[in-house]
């Protein structure tokens, strides 16, 4: 997971999310995305 500190003093956490393709379609394999989390 990556963590970025901004001038505001808050930290925003970015988290990699992985899904199986068969859960959202008909293909095999994994789908990797990036979620920008809430302010901590």
């Amino acid at each position: 997971d990556a963590e970025f500190r901004h001038d505001s003093g808050y930290e925003v956490h970015h988290q990699k999310l992985v899904f199986f393709a068969e859960d959202v379609g008909s293909n095999k394999g994994a789908i990797i995305g990036l979620m920008v989390g809430g302010v901590v």
Partner: nanobody
């Protein structure tokens, strides 16, 4: 109520192998996405790997890729974690977990069914 029961843990020397099993009961096995997590002393529970509902797809954490293999047997309602080339840092309590279809496979909060855990100790 879905129940998960792990077995197969134990003490193994570095470089050795173990196979963990996770028996699933009380639910429709084919509808549950299965994953494995582990928790070492003083550390957070971390994702190890997951297998799709069909068993056609797997995904692993970088730390175990190429050494660990997950499989599932629909006839036995069981998921397996084959662990090879074990290292000291693989020592942990290993948990199998189940999640609904469509949820992210690599984060704890996707999983709403958990086993009790089985201890794996890698030591010479």
């Amino acid at each position: 109520e879905v129940q998960l029961v792990e077995s197969g843990g134990g003490l193994v020397q570095p470089g050795g192998s173990l196979r963990l099993s996770c028996a699933v009961s009380g639910g429709t096995f084919s509808s549950i996405g299965m994953g494995w997590f582990r928790q070492a002393p003083g550390k957070e529970r971390e994702f190890v790997g997951a297998i799709s509902r069909s068993g056609d797809s797997t995904y692993y954490a970088d730390s175990v890729k190429g050494r660990f293999t997950i499989s599932r047997d629909g006839a036995k309602n069981t998921v397996y974690l084959q662990m090879n080339s074990l290292k000291d840092e693989d020592t942990a309590v290993y948990y199998c977990a189940g999640r609904p279809a469509g949820t992210a496979i690599n984060i704890r909060r996707s999983y709403n069914y958990w086993g009790q855990g089985t201890q794996v100790t890698v030591s010479s």
